[in-house]
Amino acid sequence: IPVIEPSVPELVVKPGATVTLRCVGNGSVEWDGPPSPHWTLYSDGSSSILSTNNATFQNTGTYRCTEPGDPLGGSAAIHLYVKDPARPWNVLAQEVVVFEDQDALLPCLLTDPVLEAGVSLVRVRGRPLMRHTNYSFSPWHGFTIHRAKFIQSQDYQCSALMGGRKVMSISIRLKVQKVIPGPPALTLVPAELVRIRGEAAQIVCSASSVDVNFDVFLQHNNTKLAIPQQSDFHNNRYQKVLTLNLDQVDFQHAGNYSCVASNVQGKHSTSMFFRVVESAYLNLSSEQNLIQEVTVGEGLNLKVMVEAYPGLQGFNWTYLGPFSDHQPEPKLANATTKDTYRHTFTLSLPRLKPSEAGRYSFLARNPGGWRALTFELTLRYPPEVSVIWTFINGSGTLLCAASGYPQPNVTWLQCSGHTDRCDEAQVLQVWDDPYPEVLSQEPFHKVTVQSLLTVETLEHNQTYECRAHNSVGSGSWAFIPISAGAHTHPPDEFLFTP
């Protein structure tokens, strides 16, 4: 720790005196203290001399010597009083700026320690302090207003009793700044606006902050608009509101509107788009394909996006057939508003049944007319297979009927032994039927195909199997010739019930 000579905590001298303060440390040392006139500084290695040959009341203050190279940051200090009978105060600042709830030090330094008993703090022109002003005094540092409030932003003077009369210091302006967390908060209403030419419109830009010092403006396509500003103060916030009223909008009013507010912390801006249209509009669209295929038993949500102005006067989902005259349950229809002019309508179809395949239409109406968007829903089924033995044109023929959606493919297998299903080891022959005959193919129904396998002689210790498959699954039917006649076996696993 550096050492100061003279080695006293306080030094009291008269104006005009010569003062020499010497500081010695292990390494280089530095003096610091309040800005004051007449000092000269002389440094010589590990010592530094601060001196004046004409001390004035302005030299009153605490002088600190530090050793910059000291990792512990040790320092020594001495307080100098220059006792001037005409000047009881050395004021180190014209203004003190603090944030709310910080302590505010008003740096009136007493030039004579004897005067400490008679000091007080007042507002200028002798006005008393505001109620609840909590302050303390230190002859070395001045008056401290504890946890300063914005309302205490005032001009203050320090008062000392000298020979029975009060002597005031020059004034110090205290500025207590509100703690501004950031740029002003902004709202721009509405977030989006559509109007038909000739209609009225209103756009409101408002900004608020804990501090009154902020600016707000509304601009249209980068042009600042001259709008009267309304100011208010509530909930401990200052509010500034700009309202743009348009009685009859035209196309030149359309475009981007930005609400911009700024303060010392920075700038905030938010934007909205104003569309002016010739007439009402109603647009329906879907991100989904309008032709849907779903496996029977599964669920599906049909979604329609609606863009409309003015707002919808009515909407509903309708089932257009072909299977029944049932209508979607209202509880399965859901509407969500994305924003003022865009909505999403959803129809939920859980655990689809065969009778629910068909066309679903969403209808909506506004003053611009009505629109519809129709979905076609086809259900997918795994194949169902059956085999019979018959004679066609005198030839023994195995006839396989397969029904499912999408259209099933058919494969015939001949295998040794009697079995419900041919496995690889038993297979003697395989025939693919690339073009089975389509027996029925109606929209929203299963596709039924037929495949013929001509067999000259039925081998009695063999099995003939018809297999059908599509993207959903597969089905098969095993035909076992028996001496007494043909015998067919649907496979055990074919127990599908939709």
Partner: antibody, heavy 117, light 109 residues
Framework: QVQLQESGPGLVKPSETLSLTCTVS????????WSWIRQPAGKGLEWIGR???????NYNPSLKSRVTMSVETSKNQFSLNLSSVTAADTAVYYC???????????WGQGTLVTVSS | QSVLTQPPSASGTPGQRVTISCSGS????????VNWYQQFPGTAPKLLIY???QRPSGVPDRFSGSKSGTSASLAISGLQSEDEADYYC??????????FGGGTKLTVL
């Protein structure tokens, strides 16, 4: 080694407020006086004012009505606000540490502020 | 108009001794110490001399300062090409406001 860094917008519109912040690193802001100095292009230096770590300030009389300085010791930063700016306020603005005999031993590198619409 | 008065320019040849003057009044230089700064184009000023005649560490002893009454001067002996820069004097006035000279552009011929 103490280092100072000025920051703030490089362009300010006339009549608006110029706001700059000086961040001190490599040392504490406490117990020192900190100044703002400016220099218009091709001209000399002008002292704007000083602030102590407790928030006490002194301002150049010619600028006093437009200047506010503040300090945030927790962030090791001090700030300058100059209101109602005109083209005459266009300059490089420096922050610096002021010592007991009025000398500035550490300076920021300076930031150019242009006042223009 | 600067409070302290300096010649706008000065010059010298390498090895020469050059002096730059700074004139003030009793309310600034007369009652307070003088400081000098060196500034190269596009950079911040650098402290050269403080408290009339004190050199910060790292400043060559070719640079020296002096003060007499209300004037001060900066002397550079053994002038070098790297000394070509702007030089400013500075002081406080009676109200402890910082005041600067207008600056002197030093050219090494």
């Amino acid at each position: 080694q103490v280092q100072l860094q000025e920051s703030g917008p490089g362009l300010v519109k006339p009549s608006e407020t110029l706001s700059l912040t000086c961040t001190v690193s490599g040392g504490s802001i406490s117990s020192y006086y900190w100044s703002w100095i400016r220099q218009p292009a091709g001209k000399g230096l002008e002292w704007i004012g000083r602030i102590y770590s407790s928030g006490t300030t002194n301002y150049n009389p010619s600028l006093k009505s437009r200047v506010t300085m503040s300090v945030e010791t927790s962030k090791n930063q001090f700030s300058l606000n100059l209101s109602s700016v005109t083209a005459a306020d266009t300059a490089v603005y420096y922050c610096a540490r002021e010592r007991i005999t009025g000398h500035f031993d550490y300076w920021g590198q300076g930031t150019l502020v242009t006042v223009s619409s | 108009q600067s409070v302290l008065t300096q010649p706008p320019s000065a010059s010298g040849t390498p090895g020469q001794r050059v002096t730059i003057s700074c004139s003030g009044s009793s309310s600034n230089i007369g009652s307070n110490t003088v400081n000098w700064y060196q500034q190269f184009p596009g950079t911040a000023p650098k402290l050269l001399i403080y408290s009339n005649n004190q050199r910060p560490s790292g400043v060559p002893d070719r640079f020296s300062g002096s003060k007499s009454g209300t004037s001060a001067s900066l002397a550079i002996s053994g002038l070098q090409s790297e000394d070509e820069a702007d030089y400013y004097c500075a002081a406080w006035d009676d109200s402890l406001n910082g005041v600067f000279g207008g600056g002197t552009k030093l050219t090494v011929l």
